[in-house]
Amino acid sequence: VLPRWRQQWSGSGTTSRFPETVLARCVKYTEVHPEMRHVDCQSVWDAFKGAFISKYPCNITEEDYQPLVKLGTQTVPCNKTLLWSRIKDLAHQFTQVQRDMFTLEDMLLGYLADDLTWCGEFNTFEINYQSCPDWRKDCSNNPVSVFWKTVSRRFAETACGVVHVMLNGSRSKIFDKNSTFGSVEVHNLQPEKVQALEAWVIHGGREDSRDLCQDPTIKELESIISKRNIRFFCKNIYRPDKFLQCVKNPEDSSCLSGI
């Protein structure tokens, strides 16, 4: 039998053992987080699968992910949301130490999908392990991009109190309108629930003593936020290594000076 023709996309294919990985992560997460013990992981996988299986992978909508979003509903306490842009590793290192703060990847749905790729094919029940659409070269409405847009929007919409965002001060655009934070999250913070957005600009160079809070892109972020009546604060984190160390050991004498 001749193999059926398969669409060639520019991006890498579905992560190997994708169904098993999602299911295993779900089981692990619900075991560790008592408030999510009621979640049926088989139903979660079915909803996840239903969002993209048998669908043309360049025509995925946020609506496709709604059953999954409903099953993964979770709330973050006020003042405990940490957004990040182009500095995922440090943000995750931070919440691993500061256990009462949460990034999207510390929530069930973000945890399930973190670093994974997936897509299906139109009119078949198969998962495409060969290639998936690339956001730039193929299409933006692909399963992975739409997933992150959907859950990021929801994460921002449900945030309350003072919301923190970690930004990469080593990049030419510290605040980038094309990032998920710049294109989705910042516009979905709710002024009636969010009093302030506090940006932490993470410096890269050891000798970098510039005030990156004065960067034009940060001023741009403040301008956007201000029109929505959300207060804006910005802090330079000159020494990210020391910053993490001081989160771990706040009573350390060296932590009384600036970081």
């Epitope: 516009h187 009636e192 892109t217 741009e220 301008s223 029109k227 929505r228």
Partner: antibody
């Protein structure tokens, strides 16, 4: 003295083009989002367009979308409005105004008059 | 047809208190920055109130307030030099635009 000075207005035929300029002085232009607002004779204020500090975010009123282009040259402290395919209903005094975070449009120019008529 | 609704005119005698209303929606007035501008005859608009606060130089006779999807401008101790057009404005999230009211012409009798 904090000032915005518009120029480039004039009489133009329908379908024609004009380029308005607005030169800023007395404040740090690169710290402000900038706007164009117009006022037709005997009518109220109508926001036309805005451009963010770095030019990354640009917004237009539906009435001018696809015809007008806002831009800025931070090295020259200047804001521009390129107006193409002008219509009679674009006849107005055009003001440039900065946007100060948490305040509003707190500095306005004196305005430049654009008349579209055959 | 303006996105924000204002009465076209208002009037009062010197010393009186006058209030001008501005009605909008949750995508503009309710959650976002609200401004009031004063435009004296033949001049450019001037920022009068931002977020219920006055820029320096604006007399304390002028005050702003907001409740839900409506905002209002109050002028107490009305003076003849207050005769002008007054506009409310707000950022609109759903339109990604600044929206203005149609303006209220204040006459001091």
């Amino acid at each position: 003295e904090v000032q915005l000075l518009e120029s480039g207005g004039g009489l133009v035929q329908p379908g024609g083009s004009l380029r308005l300029s607005c030169v800023a002085s007395g404040f740090t232009f690169t710290n402000y989002e900038m706007n164009w607002v117009r006022q037709a004779p005997g009518k109220g204020l109508e926001w036309v367009s805005s451009i963010s500090i770095t030019g990354n975010y640009i917004y237009y009123a539906d009435s001018v979308k696809g015809r007008f282009t806002i831009s800025r040259d931070n090295s020259k402290n200047t804001l521009y409005l390129q107006m193409n395919d002008l219509r009679a209903e674009d006849t107005a005094v055009y003001y440039c105004a900065n946007y100060k975070s948490y305040h509003g449009m707190d500095v306005w120019g004196q305005g430049t008059t654009v008349t579209v008529s055959s | 047809q303006s996105v924000l609704t204002q009465p076209p005119s208002a009037s009062g005698t010197p010393g009186q208190r006058v209030t001008i209303s501005c009605s909008g929606s949750s995508s503009n007035i309710k959650n976002n920055l609200v401004n009031w501008y004063q435009q004296l005859p033949g001049t450019a608009p001037k920022l009068l109130i931002y977020n219920n606060q006055r820029p320096s130089g604006v007399p304390d006779r002028f005050s702003g307030s907001k409740s839900g999807t409506s905002a209002s401008l109050a002028i107490s101790g009305l003076q003849s030099e207050d005769e002008a057009d007054y506009y409310c404005a707000a950022w609109d999230d759903s339109l990604n635009a600044w929206v203005f009211g149609g303006g209220t012409k204040l006459t001091v009798l």
